[in-house]
Interface confidence: low
């Protein structure tokens, strides 16, 4: 019998694992796996860490088979591999494992941190850069200042943080950050704690987002007809009410100016 | 050894459903796929589904995808098959039989059959 | 679905003889077949899987050959015992066919 604690390992070369619509998702959204081949295959299988067993196969004579998880809960959140075989190869051998693809099932992101680089204290002329860091990459991130009630930046990040500038002269303010996934169906951080920039001889201070008094909610995104954004009044009664910015179609991300980009 | 131990012969009415059973023995019940295999009087082995016990994750045979549901339950490391809407087409030996290879393929393992009767 | 056609459909042959019976695919399987014993009343066993590996405790004489969309299974000098029906199953692509079965019967 063949008991490998792992899918045995070979020289066939390695398929890709995908996700639609995302990695990250909200529980109940339906979930597609795309295991894709380098070459025709026979079987796919979808494994989790520790299975012997894949946790679903597909008999699929090409290079592509989709694994359907549907409704998905937190609990079906985690890592998957996706591994192949050919008819031709004998028992029990499969290709190389995929890399590995987190799964992330919740219903809000963990909250971002703000911090000011060089320092929150702006110096005369001296422009700061604000980093909004969360623990995800490929997000898009968005800065808000009080007063003002859209957005005031917005950054698509490959990495799991996003650098706003502000120039010098308009820097001092209140702004707080979060970060959503880029695309429907939308999940949204809870809000960083916000940031006080002051100029050089006033005190910077942190306070509780939840508690920063004149913060507006922003007004709503640019329309975009094949996504709708979430409301997010059930789980945010207090503070801002954030949503995505959603793309201005629905076909590409567009990193130029969002609408209305005041202050900076 | 390895065991696939089926419940008896059942004598059942038309239009109703029946749950057969198939326990293992003899090794980790999660570690392989169990298959469902249908054989009807002076006919064919006609293969009806596969369930990894693990994670739940099932396959069918579109003939029998509105007929057969498969179940397993990993703490009596007992698989089910339930057959509905019964009919005299559904009078058959029905077997349970546990792959080879650890992701579902040659069956090596066989139950001893459950026979089905469907008769008003 | 993919169907496999198996000769003969029965087979009538004394102890000792040597007797070959063929599995033809619809479509390309590679070496993806297995081939099983059934007898009355009893439980199928496998003989062989990936066309040509013998199952455990399967005697030397049964052996089989073939890839593609022909297959077949041999068994030399039979022995009383291997009497009963014949099964192949292909195992490319859901649904997994078997074989319309060869009844192997004593002269």
């Known amino acids: 019998d063949i008991t490998p604690s792992v899918p045995p390992a070979s020289y066939h070369p390695k398929p890709w694992l995908g996700a639609q619509p995302a990695t990250v998702v909200t529980p109940g959204v339906n979930v597609t796996l795309r295991c894709r081949a380098p070459q025709p295959a026979w079987r796919f299988g979808l494994f989790k860490p520790g299975e012997i067993a894949p946790l679903l196969f597909r008999d699929v004579s090409s290079e592509l088979a989709e694994f359907f998880l549907e409704e998905v809960t937190p609990a079906q959140g985690g890592i998957y591999r996706c591994c192949y075989r050919r008819p031709d190869w004998g028992p029990g051998v499969w290709s190389q494992p995929s890399d590995v693809l987190e799964l992330l099932v919740t219903e809000e992101l963990p909250r971002p941190s703000l911090v000011a680089l060089p320092g929150p204290v702006v110096g005369p002329g001296a422009n700061v850069s604000l980093r909004c860091a969360g623990r995800l990459r490929n997000m898009s991130f968005v800065l808000y200042r009080e007063g003002v009630a859209a957005p005031l930046q917005y950054r698509h990040s490959a990495q799991p943080w996003a650098d706003f500038t502000l120039l010098g002269a308009r820097a001092p303010g209140t702004y707080s950050c979060y970060y959503h996934t880029p695309s429907a169906p939308y999940v949204l951080s809870q809000r960083s704690e916000v940031l006080v920039i002051s100029w050089e001889g006033e005190g910077p201070e942190a306070r509780p987002a939840s508690s920063a008094p004149g913060m507006q909610a922003p007004g709503p995104p640019p329309s975009d007809p094949g996504a709708q954004a979430p409301s997010l009044s059930s789980f945010r009664p207090r503070g801002l009410v954030l949503q995505p910015l959603l793309p201005q179609t629905q076909d590409s991300w567009d990193p130029a100016p969002p609408p209305s980009d005041p202050g900076v | 050894q390895v065991q696939l131990q089926q419940s008896g012969a059942e004598l059942v009415r038309p239009g109703t459903s029946v749950k057969v059973s198939c326990k293992a023995s003899?090794?980790?019940?999660?570690?392989?796929?169990i298959e469902w295999v249908k054989k009807r009087p002076g006919q064919g082995l006609e293969w009806i589904g596969v369930?990894?016990?693990?994670?739940?994750?099932?396959n069918y045979n579109e003939k029998f995808e509105n007929k057969a549901t498969l179940t397993a339950d990993k703490s009596s490391s007992t698989a089910y098959m339930q057959l509905s809407s019964l009919t005299s087409d559904d009078s058959a030996v029905y077997f349970c039989?546990?792959?080879?290879?650890?992701?579902?393929?040659?069956?090596?393992?066989w139950g001893q059959g459950t026979l089905v009767t469907v008769s008003a | 679905d993919i169907q496999m056609t198996q000769s003969p459909a029965s087979l009538s042959v004394s102890v000792g003889e040597t007797v070959t019976i063929t599995c033809r695919a619809s479509?390309?399987?590679?070496?993806?077949l297995a081939w099983y014993q059934q007898k009355q009343g009893k439980s199928p066993q496998l003989l062989v899987y990936?066309?040509?590996n013998l199952a455990d405790g399967v005697p030397s004489r049964f052996s089989g050959s073939g890839s593609g969309t022909q297959f077949s299974l041999k068994i030399n000098s039979l022995q009383p015992e291997d009497f009963g029906s014949y099964y192949c199953?292909?195992?490319?692509?859901?649904?997994?066919?078997f074989g319309g079965g060869t009844k192997l019967e004593i002269k």
């Open positions: 039989a546990r792959s080879l290879d650890f992701d579902g393929a040659w069956f090596a393992y």
């Open positions: 003899g090794y980790a019940f999660t570690n392989y796929m």
């Open positions: 369930i990894n016990p693990g994670s739940g994750g099932t």
């Open positions: 479509e390309k399987i590679y070496s993806n």
């Open positions: 990936a066309a040509t």
């Open positions: 199953q292909h195992f490319w692509g859901i649904p997994w066919t």
